[in-house]
């Protein structure tokens, strides 16, 4: 993808509200394009935090102003709205609701949007066109939610706004305004290292891949030209600069080794694949 | 920009619509508030439309007033006038993220009620 | 539906002083509220929205404050422009409360 991003991309806020009991209560709002996180709310001073000097997109400060009342408001509402009806939903304390929502983007279109949000970790209604709707699995507590939630259908016109129109248009002019950052390029660094053994007389080798950007990578232990099918790759992990850490896993007997090689191939790298072999490894960590 | 029109004197009793022209934005995406203003008095809400339809109404005005609207235009129509509706009626924008308030407003129109 | 209790009713205030108007609702709005500013024959002017963001192109001197049922429009450095009736209007819950406006503060500058 030209953005460094993996299609179809996404701008969603996530909020996720701890009730601890009646009157203790905390809560984390979040902003992320795709897997990357561009802003954060901080409770305190209720003001939206932007997390890179491109976060802002093409909104002007009198539209981040509105949206951050709204955000502050809808916020100190939802915590009302959730205290005042947790006994009638039989939510019981302590309970956490998390919602997530926002839009998607396909071959640089608007694909949809989305808005859900869950109980203790499990679907309970979602809101679709113009209304809140129960996952039919959450029964009668999501249906009598949404029955509140429904009241107000200005506000509800006020949130469908935010997913059909603020999304999408926020979502052009921050890939407009990141260009420069999503379509870096950044080398990744491999090494090698034994992992904790198997068992007697089998090693496990492990090959890392760090500092890497965009994310899609390819990571095998080969023999030759041969890819070794019991390659375990770990998860992608998140670095704090902003770029990727993976490690790749092989077990095998002490004797066969020798002749396996760890390659990378990463766009940064033009067709140059990293490959290190194993026998010119450092027996040292 | 937004602008009332239709306030005349009229009998008790006697229907009459509002009308408040929009331009430079959509009333699918904004919802419009009517206001009220008796000489020499203070602000009195009366109600809203939703930018998808709905309508809501200070307790007071229900039944006594109808909002509607068309894609340019919003109306209100003051079904049975009596001597207390005499006032200037505003109609206003309701901002884009905004649960009530309004920072855009028309002139305001004057209705007279007298026999 | 909310009563929006304002005061005062009418005051005076000095070129350059600092002049403060409450606005006490029946109960809890959460933040939802707006303060305008309206001239004789004009129609009302936004000045503050979500109890303290201050509306497009007012100036600085204008400042909303307060949460719950308490809140407050103070302006400093009061200028003969400022002379006017100053109104609250709840904007908290639309479909139950209604955007009830208070009774209006009229502001004379001397």
């Known amino acids: 993808n030209a953005d460094g991003l993996k299609e179809p991309l996404s701008f969603h806020v996530t909020w996720i509200a701890s009730f601890y009991n009646h009157s203790w209560k905390q809560n984390l709002v979040s902003g992320w394009l795709s897997d990357l996180q561009t802003h954060t709310w901080d409770s305190n001073s209720s003001t939206i935090v932007f997390l890179c000097p491109w976060s802002r997109g093409n909104f002007s400060n009198e539209e981040w102003k509105e949206l951050e009342t709204l955000f502050r408001i809808r916020t100190i509402r939802s915590f009302e709205g959730i205290r005042r009806y947790a006994h009638e939903l039989q939510f019981e304390y302590p309970f956490e609701i998390q919602v997530t929502g926002g839009c998607e983007l396909h071959s640089g279109k608007v694909s949809g949007s989305f808005l859900q949000l869950a109980y203790q970790g499990s679907d309970f209604v979602s809101f679709q066109n113009n209304s809140w709707l129960p996952y039919p699995v959450a029964g009668n507590m999501a249906k009598h939610f949404c029955k509140v939630l429904n009241q107000n259908q200005h506000e509800n016109d006020i949130t469908h706004n935010l997913l059909s129109d603020t999304c999408p248009r926020f979502i052009l002019g921050l890939l407009d305004a990141g260009k420069a950052h999503l379509q870096r390029q950044v080398k990744p660094e491999a090494w090698l290292s034994h992992g904790p053994s198997p068992g007697p007389g089998h090693l496990q080798l492990v090959c890392h891949v760090s500092g890497f950007y965009p994310k899609p990578v390819w990571v095998m232990w080969m023999r030759g030209e041969q890819e070794q099918q019991g390659t375990q790759r770990g998860d992608i992990l998140p670095s704090a600069d902003g770029t990727w850490y993976l490690r790749a896993t092989l077990e095998v007997a002490a004797g066969e080794a020798a002749d396996l090689s760890c390659r990378v191939k990463h766009s940064s790298l033009e067709g140059q694949d990293i490959v290190l072999y194993w026998e010119h490894h450092s027996s040292v960590g | 920009s937004v602008e009332e029109s239709g306030g005349r004197l009229v009998t008790p009793g006697t229907p009459l619509t509002l009308t408040c022209t929009v331009s430079g934005f959509s009333l699918s995406s904004y919802a419009m508030s009517w206001v009220r203003q008796a000489p020499g008095k203070g602000l009195e809400w009366i109600g809203i439309i939703s930018s998808s339809g709905t309508t809501y109404y200070a307790s007071w005005a229900k039944g006594r007033f109808t909002i509607s609207k068309t894609s340019t235009t919003v109306d209100l129509k003051i079904t049975s006038p009596t001597t207390e509706d005499t006032a200037t009626y505003f109609c206003?924008?309701?901002?884009?993220?905004?649960?009530?308030?309004?920072?855009?407003w028309g002139p305001g129109t004057l209705v007279t009620v007298s026999s | 539906a909310v009563e929006m209790t304002q005061t005062p009713a009418s005051m005076s205030a000095a070129v350059g002083g600092t002049v403060t108007i409450k606005c006490q609702a029946s109960?809890?709005?959460?933040?939802?509220l707006a303060w305008y500013q309206q001239k004789p024959g004009q129609p009302p002017k936004l000045l503050i929205y979500?109890?303290?963001t201050l509306a497009s192109g007012v100036p600085s001197r204008f400042k909303g404050s307060g949460s719950g049922t308490e809140y407050t429009l103070t302006i400093s450095g009061v200028q003969c422009d400022d002379a006017a009736t100053y109104y609250c209007q709840c904007t908290y819950d639309t479909s139950s409360y209604g955007n009830t406006f208070g009774g209006g503060t009229e502001m004379v500058v001397e």
């Open positions: 109960e809890d709005i959460y933040s939802n």
């Open positions: 979500g109890a303290s």
């Open positions: 206003a924008r309701v901002d884009y993220y905004s649960s009530g308030w309004g920072g855009l």
